[in-house]
Interface confidence: medium
């Protein structure tokens, strides 16, 4: 009995899937804006995924969590740079700068200790991480409301 039900369910799912494929193909051929809308939806999904990545950042109101995150990111960044993984290392350093209470001071220190090309890479990535922080804060405020 269970086997029969499973077979029916599988058949229904298969039929639905084939139906969806036919619908998708017809829509793609007949609607000139379909491709654009699809691209737009994928862009939105990508953005949502990136926003979901914000969970990596600590609760900015929790000083202890921020400090722990800061130290971990500096260390990870440092170790990755030592291994020649400059891109990844810089990503972690920018995370640390983003949650740092005195980013200007930290940047001055990093300017002295990092090789110039690495420091330049860091500067180019800063606006992106700053935007992430702003998004994280606004998302947190939305949650409160």
């Amino acid at each position: 009995m269970v086997g029969r039900n499973s077979a029916i369910a599988a058949g229904v799912c298969g039929a639905l899937f084939i139906g969806y494929c036919i619908y998708f193909d017809r829509k793609r051929r007949s609607d000139p804006n379909f491709k654009n809308r699809l691209r737009e939806r994928r862009k939105k999904q990508k953005l949502a995924k990136e926003r979901a990545g914000l969970s990596k950042l600590p609760d900015l109101k929790d000083a202890e969590a921020v400090q722990k995150f800061f130290l971990e990111e500096i260390q990870l960044g440092e170790e990755l740079l030592a291994q020649g993984e400059y891109e990844k290392g810089v990503d972690h350093l920018t995370n640390a700068i983003a949650v740092c209470g005195q980013p200007q001071q930290l940047l001055q220190v990093l300017q002295q200790t990092l090789p110039p090309p690495v420091f330049q890479m860091l500067l180019t990535k800063l606006p992106t991480i700053s935007q992430r922080i702003v998004s994280a804060q606004s998302l947190a405020e939305d949650d409160v409301e």
Partner: nanobody
Framework: AVQLVESGGGLVQAGGSLRLSCVAS????????MGWYRQAPGKQRVLVAT???????NYADSVKGRFTISRDNTKNTVYLQMNSLKPEDTSVYYC????????????????WGQGTQVTVSS
């Protein structure tokens, strides 16, 4: 992050010897100053001995001449050889790894093991 796992603790008679080991994983071991600390029940954790990445050692006065700290960077391991043990050496012994940040000199990274019990009976 660095993980530290101690071993070698146990029960020993006064005057006996024990050798503690601490294996580090997760980072470049040779960059760290390694140390052993101990904590007796109801007391604060205190320094026993440290060894720098270059091999320079430092000991608490109470263990000088009896304990020897050493490290093997190829095995990511630090050792504490404890001779002429006394009942007052009874404690939980903790392994510690510490290093300053290269890129942010004011920062230090500090890691601790879970501890290993050493009991010296009289």
């Amino acid at each position: 992050a660095v993980q530290l796992v101690e071993s070698g603790g146990g029960l020993v008679q006064a005057g006996g010897s024990l050798r503690l080991s601490c294996v580090a994983s997760g980072s470049t071991f040779s960059n760290f100053v390694m140390g052993w600390y101990r904590q007796a029940p109801g007391k604060q954790r205190v320094l026993v001995a440290t060894i720098s990445s270059g091999g320079s050692t430092n000991y608490a006065d109470s263990v000088k001449g009896r304990f020897t700290i050493s490290r093997d960077n190829t095995k990511n391991t630090v050792y504490l050889q404890m001779n002429s043990l006394k009942p007052e050496d009874t404690s939980v012994y903790y392994c510690n790894a510490r290093r300053g940040s290269v890129i942010v000199p004011t920062l230090a990274y500090d890691y601790w093991g879970q501890g290993t019990q050493v009991t010296v009976s009289s």
